[in-house]
């Protein structure tokens, strides 16, 4: 059985299209699962990974390894 | 159970600003972007932009870009969606919905916010 | 930007009737495509997504089909319920575009 595009297993009832824009940046496997791409995670694969030791309660950030503090903090960590 | 929960209505006047909130409980509030999606009496279904709360990214329809902007708090797990230069055709019911669990769109709707613009 | 055209804008039917709505749209969505219920004063439910695929506790009486552009909503027997206005709507690529929607009255 040849599945439609984006759609993967038994049945082809698994959707999955490869993405890498704001609404996810992911890879699909040969089962139709998402595996994100480096630096992202997430279900959706849609939230950056921030720099390693940024504060998670006063950093943030919209792109992998970046580390933007809320306003207050400050800092290579925002701590 | 993912519950979506909106302030009450507002009566604006045309060139002022609103700021309606969307209250997310049920789920992890980062791992989703929240959407925006407006609807004028008797009229379709407008996208209006995404938020996405870990980081703040935003993606805007070209038509609302630079009078519309999407915040969120991640401490309190809720989204805002501020218009300003308010004008009458802007008066209708405001929703913030959510993504479902597979990739598919709006699974998830808030219950809506009517905002009326008159002099 | 992708533009989703719906039609019929409104359509009188019966109960039992079968009923079919279609969405085509302005660039190949390849099945990135919804479809919703919203009954007045009411927020929109989600019926259909990835263009086929039934959302959770929705009637089997819903199908979808289509591919590229063109897309179908049908009801296979209506129910009393089920006169509503219907929406499609593609999320291939933001903007995430509407079709102005199907009003389903009571013949």
């Known amino acids: 059985v040849t599945c439609d595009d984006y759609y993967y297993g038994f049945g082809c009832n698994k959707f999955c299209r490869p993405r890498d824009d704001f609404f996810g940046h992911y890879a699909c496997d040969q089962n139709g699962n998402k595996t994100c791409m480096e630096g992202w995670m997430g279900p959706e694969c849609n939230r950056a990974i921030c720099r390693q030791g940024c504060s998670p309660k006063h950093g943030s950030c919209k792109l992998p390894g970046d580390c933007r503090c809320q306003y207050g903090w400050q800092g290579l960590y925002c701590d | 159970q993912v519950q979506l929960v909106q302030s009450g209505a507002e009566l604006k006047k045309p060139g002022s600003s609103v700021k309606v909130s969307c209250k997310a409980s049920g789920y992890t509030f980062t791992d989703y972007e929240m959407h925006w999606v407006r609807q004028a009496p008797g009229q379709g279904l407008e996208w209006m932009g995404a938020?996405?709360?870990?980081?703040?990214?935003?993606a805007y329809a070209q038509k609302f870009k630079g009078r519309v902007t999407l915040t969120a708090d991640k401490s309190t797990s809720t989204a805002y969606m501020e218009l300003s230069s308010l004008r009458s055709e802007d008066t209708a019911v405001y929703y913030c919905?959510?993504?479902?669990?597979?990739?598919?769109?709006?699974?998830?709707w808030g219950q809506g916010t009517l905002v009326t613009v008159s002099s | 930007d992708i533009q989703m055209t719906q039609s019929p804008s409104s359509l009188s039917a019966s109960v039992g009737d079968r009923v079919t709505i279609t969405c085509r749209a302005s660039?190949?969505?390849?099945?990135?495509l919804a479809w919703y219920q919203q009954k007045p004063g009411k927020a929109p439910k989600l019926l259909i997504y990835?263009?086929?695929t039934l959302a959770d506790d929705v009637p089997s009486r819903f199908s979808g089909s289509g591919s590229g552009t063109d897309y179908t909503l049908t009801i296979s027997s209506l129910q009393p319920e089920d006169f509503a206005t219907y929406y499609c709507q593609h999320f291939w690529s933001a903007p995430w575009t509407f079709g102005g929607g199907t009003k389903l009255e009571i013949k």
């Open positions: 660039g190949n969505i390849h099945n990135y």
């Open positions: 919905t959510r993504r479902g669990y597979d990739d598919y769109p709006f699974a998830y």
């Open positions: 990835n263009a086929k």
């Open positions: 938020i996405q709360p870990g980081g703040g990214g935003t």
